[in-house]
């Protein structure tokens, strides 16, 4: 296998996007590199230009079709190659036989909104984006709430072990500003990982009513 001192990691968003990151020890000269995708049972192939994300790391997104189109299935294997320009030719820098449904990372949940807020609790809902219908209900979520004076890293994780696109946050402090994030993961796939965290949703609990607690 072509590896050398490089690392080539890709994830499928379950619909029409494969995102890849390639890391290479030792600086490359100003050269053009690409990821090529060749499915074993499809008529199409796809290419994306690797762009630097750090001194020794490059990334790109293989757009396989319309965002909600189901471009790959559990039986597909896609040969992914990193090719870099040398002279007039391309050199294979890294290669992997990619099983899309073993390497899943969904898009971050979207459309977060406060359904109902009180002094001590808040009900929040969200939607999943570009997730395959193959999963049916086989998804799990993690959520976290940012309290004043704390960091996201300190926030305790709330786990939802089923496809539940809402949460009721309890024991909140009245009249306090919070932020909330959620992420999603399919149960399927040996190398499947959590989606990125959603954009934070800011909300404020209601102030306590004078003389009584609602």
């Amino acid at each position: 296998a072509v590896n050398g001192t490089s690392q080539f990691t890709c994830f499928y968003n379950s619909r029409a996007n494969i995102s890849c990151v390639w890391s290479q020890d030792g600086a490359l000269q100003d050269t053009s590199c690409q990821v090529h995708a060749w499915p074993d049972r499809r008529r199409w192939n796809q290419t994306c230009e690797l762009l630097p994300v750090s001194q020794a790391s490059w990334a790109c997104n293989l757009i396989l079709g319309a965002p909600d189109s189901q471009k790959l299935t559990t039986v597909d294997i896609v040969t992914l190659r990193v090719l870099c320009r040398e002279g007039v030719r391309w050199r294979v820098m890294a290669i992997q036989d990619f099983k899309p449904f073993e390497n899943l990372r969904l898009m971050a949940p979207i459309s977060l909104q406060v359904v109902h807020v009180e002094t001590h609790r808040c009900n929040i809902s969200w939607e999943i984006s570009q997730a395959s219908h193959y999963f049916e209900r086989h998804l799990e979520f993690e959520a976290r709430t940012l309290s004043p004076g704390h960091t996201w890293e300190e926030a305790p994780l709330l786990t939802l072990k089923q496809k539940q696109e809402w949460i009721c946050l309890e024991t909140l402090t009245p009249d306090t500003q919070y932020e909330f994030q959620v992420r999603v993961k399919p149960l399927q796939g040996e190398f499947t990982t959590w989606s990125p965290w959603s954009q934070p949703l800011a909300f404020r609990t209601k102030p306590a009513a004078l003389g009584k607690d609602t």
Epitope: V2, Q24, V88, R89, V92
Partner: antibody, heavy 121, light 112 residues
């Protein structure tokens, strides 16, 4: 059957230019690179550079930059190598060779028969 | 540029006997992708070069199994297990790891 057929021998005066052709058959011309390699009499092999006929992109060995020009005519599946400001040291056999556009395994698999270029006053 | 040095310059051999050619590169020719693009070419008298071995030890299609390649880093060897009359010619090593690609000076194999 892959074949690369080169033009005939040339005799040139110092300071002149020579243009060697290489006609490809037996494969899709625009799918492979054409490399040029020269061999001075009784000497070893020297890689001069190459052209990708698909987009006419070229890469020249620094040693020949400014004097060598590689071109192609896809309509007749032919690659050309022109060397200018000839000197006696350019007397050599010039080979074209086919190479994969993606260098996975080897640089050159099939070679032309060679064209002898003699530079003499 | 990577300088490829071959030895010996000339190699007289007896038919049916083994032969060994050495090739040394002036710097490591492991490509940054982890592969070593060391190739061997044979040039019979009056003919064009012919690819024998690629990536150190892989025989090109149609090449007899009496030819084998080995080595790593900067030191490489081409072996002919039992020399036949048709093996007479000049053998060149070649590195395709670092542009400009370069050839060794050649080793002439002749029959004693």
């Amino acid at each position: 059957e892959v074949q690369l057929v080169q033009s005939g021998a040339e005799v040139k005066k110092p300071g002149a230019s020579v243009k060697v052709s290489c006609k490809a058959s037996g494969y899709t011309f625009t799918d492979y690179v054409i490399s040029w390699v020269r061999q001075a009499t009784g000497q070893g092999l020297e890689w001069m550079g190459e052209i990708y006929p698909g987009d006419a992109n070229t890469y020249y060995n620094e040693m020949f930059k400014g004097r060598v020009t590689m071109t192609r005519d896809t309509s007749i599946s032919t690659a050309y190598m022109e060397l200018s400001s000839l000197r006696s040291e350019d007397t050599a056999v010039y080979y074209c060779a086919r190479g994969s556009y993606t260098y996975d395994n080897y640089a050159m698999d099939f070679w032309g028969q060679g064209t002898t270029v003699t530079v003499s006053s | 540029d990577v300088v490829m040095t071959q030895s010996p310059l000339s190699l007289p051999v007896t038919l049916g006997q083994p032969a060994s050619i050495s090739c040394r590169s002036s710097q490591n020719i492991v490509h940054s992708n982890g592969n070593t693009y060391l190739e061997w070419f044979q040039q019979r008298p009056g003919q064009s070069p012919r690819l024998l071995i690629y990536k150190v030890s892989n025989r090109f299609s149609g090449v007899p199994d009496r030819f084998s390649g080995s080595g790593s880093g900067t030191d490489f060897t081409l072996k002919i297990s039992r020399v036949e009359a048709e093996d007479v010619g000049v053998y060149y090593c070649f590195q395709g790891s670092h542009i400009p690609w370069t050839f060794g000076g050649g080793t002439k194999v002749e029959i004693k």
